[in-house]
C-alpha cells in the first residue's frame, strides 16, 4: 500500500477546522475490516486518531479529531481537526496498514491574522518641526510572530530608532508593539505595516502630522 499526503504544509487559522489529507489506493475487493489506520504526532508518537478492527476507535487527542468514514473505503484516510489551536501546530504522521504498510507525514502550520494597528504619539500635542516624537504601532492576537516595517510619507523605509517587541498571551498568540522615534519635519506621514509571515497578511496603520492639529487617517 502507498500512502500519499500533501508535501506543502497545511495552513489553518486559529479556531477554524483543518483537514490533513492522506490517501491510499485500495486493491479490488478491499474492505474496511482489513484496514488499520493510525494518525499520530510525528515527533512524540502521541496517538491522535485510529481506525482498527473494522471500526473508528475515535479521537485520542482532545476530542477534536474525526475521520471521513464514508470515504475510507475509497482510500481517503484524511483527518479533520476541529477548532485549531496554536498547540496543534507540528507534524502528523498517517500510517496505513492493509497487508503491508506505509506512512507519510504532513505538517500543520497554524496562523492567526493580526488586527489593524492602532497608532499612538507621545507627546500628542503642541508638536513643532524639530520635535522628537515617539510613534507606537500596536497590533494584536496574531500568530506566528510578526514582521514590522515603517515608512515615511514618500514610502522610504525607516529602520533607525525602531524597537519592536512581541508579547505572548495565554493562547500562544502574539501582540506586537513597535516604537519609532523620529524628529518631525514640517509635516509628514508615518506608517507601519505589520506582516503575518505565514498568511502574507499585511495590516497597515498610519499617522499624519500636518502642522496643527494632528490627524489620524480614518479607518479603512
Amino acid at each position: 500500500v502507498e500512502v500519499q499526503v500533501s508535501e506543502d504544509p497545511v495552513v489553518a487559522l486559529v479556531d477554524t477546522d483543518a483537514t490533513l489529507r492522506c490517501s491510499f489506493s485500495p486493491e479490488p475487493g478491499f474492505s474496511l475490516a482489513q484496514l488499520n489506520l493510525i494518525w499520530q504526532l510525528t515527533d512524540t508518537k502521541q496517538l491522535v486518531h485510529s481506525f482498527t478492527e473494522g471500526r473508528d476507535q475515535g479521537s485520542a487527542y482532545s476530542n477534536r479529531t474525526a475521520l471521513f468514514p464514508d470515504l475510507l473505503v475509497q482510500g481517503n484516510a484524511s483527518l479533520r481537526l476541529q477548532r485549531v489551536r496554536v498547540t496543534d501546530e507540528g507534524s502528523y504522521t498517517c500510517f496505513v496498514s492493509i497487508q503491508d504498510f506505509d506512512s507519510a507525514a504532513v505538517s500543520l502550520q497554524v496562523a492567526a491574522p493580526y488586527s489593524k494597528p492602532s497608532m499612538t504619539l507621545e507627546p500628542n500635542k503642541d508638536l513643532r518641526p524639530g520635535n522628537m516624537v515617539t510613534i507606537t504601532c500596536s497590533s494584536y492576537q496574531g500568530y506566528p510572530e510578526a514582521e514590522v516595517f515603517w515608512k515615511d510619507g514618500q514610502g522610504v523605509p525607516l529602520t533607525g530608532n525602531v524597537t519592536t517587541s512581541q508579547m505572548a498571551n495565554e493562547r500562544g498568540l502574539f501582540d506586537v508593539h513597535s516604537v519609532l522615534r523620529v524628529v518631525l519635519g514640517a509635516n509628514g506621514t508615518y506608517s507601519c505595516l505589520v506582516r503575518n509571515p505565514v498568511l502574507q497578511q499585511d495590516a497597515h496603520g498610519s499617522v499624519t502630522i500636518t502642522g496643527q492639529p494632528l490627524t489620524f487617517p480614518p479607518e479603512a
Partner: antibody
Framework: EVQLVESGGGLIQPGGSLRLSCAAS????????MSWVRQAPGKGLEWVSS???????FYADNVKGRFTISRDNSKNTLYLQMNSLRAEDTAVYYC??????????????WGQGTLVTVSS | EIVLTQSPATLSLSPGERATLSCAAS???????LHWYQQKPGLAPRLLIY???NLASGIPDRFSGSGSGTDFTLTISRLEPEDFAVYYC?????????FGGGTKVEIK
C-alpha cells in the same frame, strides 16, 4: 533521539566573518522555531536570534544588521552568518529548539555549543 | 526589555539540604512563560521547569517551581550531588527573550 550539533566556531579577527552551522536530527526540523543563544566566558546566557519555520527571522538589538540567521529545511540545518565581529561577540554559541505552545515556548533541546573567539 | 535578576549569585549548601533560588522580573511576566534551566560546567543548558512549575521530561520531583507576577522561585527539596550546577530563569513573555544572570549552587 533529538540531536543538535553545532560547528563552525574558531578564532577570528575583529571585523571578520564566520558562519556557524547546527545540524539537527531526531525530529521534524522544518516545523520548529529554532534559536541561537550565546554565553560569553564565565557569563550568563543571552538570546541572539530566532527563525520561524518559514524563514522569518528576529534578532537581539546588539547583533541586528551584523548577524543573519537562516535555515535549510531540506538539510535539517540551521545557520548563523556573523559579520563585522567584535571582541564582545566572543562566546560559546548554542543552537536550541523552541518547543511548541504546550510547553509555552521553552527551549527544550540544546546543542553542545561552538566557541567563537574574536581577537587580534 | 524585561530584566531578570537572580539571587543569590552563589548558594553554598551541603547534599541533602534544601535550596531556594529566586528570580525577580523588572516587570510582570505571565507565569506560563517563565522557565528554568540547569547548566553543568562545560555542558549545554537543559530545560528543567517550564511555565513556572511544570517539570520537563526526565526531571526528578525534588525540583519544583512557584511564583507569579515579578517573583519566581525554584526549589530543590534535597540536594543530590548531581544538582550542583548553575541555574537560569528565562522569560518568553515579551521579546527580547531574556535570561537571568544565574545562580550557582555549589558544595559547601
Amino acid at each position: 533521539e533529538v540531536q543538535l550539533v553545532e560547528s563552525g566556531g574558531g578564532l577570528i579577527q575583529p571585523g571578520g566573518s564566520l558562519r556557524l552551522s547546527c545540524a539537527a536530527s531526531g525530529f521534524t526540523f522544518s516545523t520548529y522555531v529554532m534559536s541561537w543563544v550565546r554565553q560569553a566566558p564565565g557569563k550568563g546566557l543571552e538570546w541572539v536570534s530566532s527563525i520561524l519555520s518559514g524563514g522569518t527571522s528576529f534578532y537581539a538589538d546588539n547583533v541586528k544588521g551584523r548577524f543573519t540567521i537562516s535555515r535549510d529545511n531540506s538539510k535539517n540545518t540551521l545557520y548563523l552568518q556573523m559579520n563585522s565581529l567584535r571582541a564582545e561577540d566572543t562566546a560559546v554559541y548554542y543552537c536550541a529548539r523552541r518547543y511548541g505552545h504546550d510547553h509555552y515556548y521553552a527551549m527544550d533541546y540544546w546543542g553542545q555549543g561552538t566557541l567563537v573567539t574574536v581577537s587580534s | 526589555e524585561i530584566v531578570l535578576t537572580q539571587s543569590p549569585a552563589t548558594l553554598s549548601l551541603s547534599p541533602g539540604e534544601r535550596a531556594t533560588l529566586s528570580c525577580a522580573a523588572s516587570s510582570s511576566v505571565s507565569s506560563s512563560y517563565l522557565h528554568w534551566y540547569q547548566q553543568k560546567p562545560g555542558l549545554a543548558p537543559r530545560l528543567l521547569i517550564y511555565s513556572t512549575s511544570n517539570l520537563a521530561s526526565g526531571i526528578p520531583d525534588r525540583f519544583s517551581g512557584s511564583g507569579s507576577g515579578t517573583d519566581f522561585t525554584l526549589t530543590i527539596s534535597r540536594l543530590e550531588p548531581e544538582d550542583f550546577a548553575v541555574y537560569y530563569c528565562q522569560q518568553y513573555h515579551r521579546s527580547p527573550w531574556t535570561f537571568g544572570g544565574g545562580t550557582k549552587v555549589e558544595i559547601k
